[in-house]
Interface confidence: medium
């Protein structure tokens, strides 16, 4: 069937359109184009005779039409009046005619739109704004954009006038945005420039910063005021209702108690005509005096005296605080606070109570600290220590002994030999000693303030022959795989070599054996039961040598995993069950049995006469070593077969 296709269907003014003919019949004589939906000679545009290839313009020809041999019609430089229907009349050789109608629409190219507004400075929560998209254009669609996005759904937004007008009711500061309008028709789309809506708002209730309302006398007061507002607010300050200045910040240096009062900030928006105020109450406190500590005893004696520390001055309705060693007071039965916390009493002072101590007075703003106070606790003397620790010396050497005892004030020292006073010095020196210098050497320490004295006695032996040494131990019953043992060869002697033997042989090389203190101390780390041997130490010098008696190490170990014997697990009914449990352990362990989880007797041997299949089950032996604190156990299954059945069958 003959059809006409318009390419394009929607045509912009000034462009061209092609009326394309489809299914043109064969054996044609010619054809003619007409404006409109029917063949009308008055509205003929152009005719075409195929045989002569002659095109003849008609009354409706405008000079912009071109006809092609395939009957298609091109119309150039389209104008608005070209809109409508076009009819093709085809004359065939048999003089039978055919007709077909096509159409197209003409639209103008849209100009760039612009936005007009009925209110350039609307007031928040009061005014409405109507935006209109200009110009008004026929057959155009109007669209709106807010911040380059399509319009949000809002009851305050209304489109009217064919969407050409956008009205914002009761504008808010959040409506301050970029607005654009767009016009569209089938052949073009144009978007306007942005219009920024300038909403007047505020001022909101001002905020005064900083928030603190308490100040100390002598500080600077610096208050700042801010209120959200468009245009920006103008600020005024009032103190106790009296106008001060028209600034956003209020600064008063070196304030006094007289500056206490109500501070009002007023924000004013000249465009909206609105005022808002905020009031803050400022309190200025007088500077309290710096506290100090008094003591009822400046030189207390350890374990005898109490000390009462008092925080001065006494101020009514004040909180007193205490610190010891820069920390809050520890909980101690020896520390007592008075009801008002002003007095801290130390009962039965010790040398560790020296401090420093601080007290504080708390006011509304801060805590004022006193200077630290140190207690001078009188103590000691403790038992004196005589050094060096040697007790054996060879003739001809110099004897130099020093004595020290912890004491406050420092102790005064005296030396006695065999009870006879020698000298009042901390050190005792005797040159080129002989065997006659052997004896009891006593150091006496005296504290003149407390009146206390303490003594220590040391036996000094001067001999060319070395004494028989002995072995001391720091642990007489070490636990296997847990404890270490340190053997020390006594006595400590100058210019002496120390030697060790284990089971009569020199020390084996082992990472668990360590010699120290000039080989005088032998340490066994992580002892094992194999360390239970005879240990001998020896001393020698250029003149003589001697060995100690052997010391046998008693290592506590076990209990190891026990063994239940006999190993049989199958028995015949009627037999006697006699199970023995053994575990390697030092000391010997305690034994107990459980059958099927039920505790039985506390013996090494479990005996059950004439067993039956009821005696089937689990037999557990438990071993416990009270010395090592360790336990162990083993479980064994026993199967009792009825007489005459083969072992291993279950009951």
């Amino acid at each position: 069937k003959l059809t006409i296709e318009s390419t394009p269907f929607n045509v912009a003014e000034g462009k061209e359109v092609l009326l394309l003919v489809h299914n043109l019949p064969q054996h044609l004589f010619g054809y003619s184009w007409y404006k409109g939906e029917r063949v009308d000679g008055n509205r003929q545009i152009i005719g075409y005779v195929i045989g002569t290839q002659q095109a003849t313009p008609g009354p409706a020809y405008s000079g912009r039409e071109i006809i092609y041999p395939n009957a298609s019609l091109l119309i150039q430089n389209i104008i608005q009046n070209d809109t409508g229907f076009y009819t093709l009349h085809v004359i065939k050789s048999d003089l039978v005619n055919e007709e077909a109608t096509g159409q197209f629409r003409v639209y103008p190219e849209l100009p760039k739109p612009s936005i007009s507004s009925n209110n350039s400075k609307p007031v928040e929560d009061k005014d409405a704004v109507a935006f209109t998209c200009e110009p008004e254009t026929q057959d155009a669609t109007y669209l709106w954009w807010v911040n380059n996005q399509s319009l949000p759904v809002s009851p305050r937004l209304q489109l009217s006038n064919g969407n050409r007008t956008l009205t914002l009711f009761n504008v808010t500061r959040n409506d301050t945005a970029s607005y654009k309008c767009e016009t569209q028709n089938p052949v073009s789309a144009r978007r306007s420039d942005s219009v920024i809506l300038n909403v007047l708002y505020g001022p909101d209730a001002p905020t005064i910063s900083p928030l603190n309302t308490s100040y100390r006398s002598g500080e600077n007061l610096n208050l700042s005021c801010h209120a959200a507002s468009n245009p920006p607010a103008q600020y005024s300050w009032f103190v106790n209702g009296t106008f001060q200045q028209s600034t956003q910040e209020l600064f008063i240096p070196n304030i006094t108690v007289n500056n206490s009062g109500s501070y009002t900030c007023q924000a004013h928006n000249s465009d909206t005509g609105l005022n808002r105020t905020t009031v803050t109450t400022i309190t200025v406190y007088a500077e309290p005096p710096k506290p100090f500590i008094t003591s009822n005893n400046s030189n207390p004696v350890e374990d005898e005296d109490a000390v009462a520390l008092t925080c001065e001055p006494e101020i009514q309705n004040t909180t007193y605080l205490w610190w010891v060693n820069n920390q809050s007071l520890p909980v101690s039965p020896r520390l007592q606070l008075s009801n008002d916390n002003r007095t801290l009493t130390l009962l039965s002072v010790t040398r560790n109570d020296v401090g420093p101590y601080e007290c504080g007075i708390q006011n509304e703003l801060s805590v004022d600290h006193s200077d630290p106070v140190i207690l001078n606790v009188l103590y000691g003397p403790d038992d004196p220590t005589i050094s060096p620790s040697y007790t054996y010396y060879r003739p001809g050497v110099n004897l130099s002994l020093s004595c020290h005892a912890a004491s406050n004030p420092p102790a005064q020292y005296s030396w006695l030999i065999d009870g006879n006073i020698q000298q009042h010095t901390q050190e005792l020196f005797i040159s080129n000693i002989t065997e006659k210098n052997s004896g009891l050497y006593t150091c006496q320490a005296n504290n003149s303030a407390s009146g206390h004295s303490r003594t220590t006695v040391k036996t000094i032996t001067v001999s060319a022959e070395l004494p028989k040494p002995s072995i001391s131990s720091n642990n007489s019953k070490p636990v296997e795989d847990k404890d270490a043992v340190a053997f020390t060869c006594e006595p400590e002697a100058q210019n002496t070599t120390y030697l060790w033997w284990v089971n009569g042989q020199s020390l084996p090389v082992s990472p668990r054996l360590q010699l120290s203190n000039g080989n005088r101390t032998l340490t066994l780390f992580n002892v094992t039961r194999n360390d239970a041997r005879a240990y001998v130490c020896g001393i020698q010098n250029s003149v003589s040598a001697n060995r100690s008696d052997p010391v046998t190490l008693d290592v506590l170990y076990g209990p190891d995993t026990p063994i239940i014997s006999p190993p049989d697990s199958s028995y015949l009914s009627g037999a006697n069950l006699n199970l023995s449990c053994h575990s390697a352990s030092n000391p010997s362990p305690q034994y107990s049995w459980r059958i099927n989880g039920i505790p039985q007797q506390h013996t090494q041997v479990l005996f059950i006469a004439k067993i039956t299949p009821n005696n089937n089950g689990t037999y557990a032996c438990f071993v416990s070593n009270l010395a090592t604190g360790r336990n162990n156990s083993i479980v064994k299954s026993i199967t009792v077969s009825a007489s005459g059945t083969s072992p291993g069958l279950s009951a």
Epitope: N616, G617, T618, F622, N632, S633, V635, S637, A651
Partner: nanobody, 122 residues
Framework: QVQLVETGGGLVQPGGSLRPSCTAS????????MGWYRQASGKQRELVAL???????NYADSVKGRFTISRDNAKDTVYLQMNSLKPEDTAVYYC????????????????WGQGTQVTVSS
């Protein structure tokens, strides 16, 4: 610790059957024996049946031929098939597990369940 969860107790008529089960969970190195004990009101706890890892069984005389104990080692679960139940079987039935905690069979420990009530009554 080892936790034991017992299920399957309840009320049954004389001559009826029940099959309670008990599942062990927690730090089990090796379960050696699993079993059931019971305690009737006013009486001492007594062994009902047990089964060891090496298939040693033990039954109380009063349940032989009626009760069968079985064990699923993979699930650490023990079952007690109770047939031909009698009123004197009424008791709280406790699951019992015996564990060993190292390769040398040393360190034996017992664990007990909370108990499940079995009531045989017409």
């Amino acid at each position: 610790q080892v936790q034991l969860v017992e299920t399957g107790g309840g009320l049954v008529q004389p001559g009826g059957s029940l099959r309670p089960s008990c599942t062990a969970s927690g730090s089990i190195f090796s379960i050696y024996a699993m079993g059931w004990y019971r305690q009737a009101s006013g009486k001492q706890r007594e062994l009902v049946a047990l089964i060891t890892r090496d298939e040693v069984f033990n039954y109380a005389d009063s349940v032989k031929g009626r009760f069968t104990i079985s064990r699923d080692n993979a699930k650490d679960t023990v079952y007690l098939q109770m047939n031909s139940l009698k009123p004197e079987d009424t008791a709280v039935y406790y699951c019992w597990v015996e564990t060993v905690n190292d390769h040398y069979n040393s360190g034996v420990e017992d664990y007990w369940g909370q108990g499940t009530q079995v009531t045989v009554s017409s």
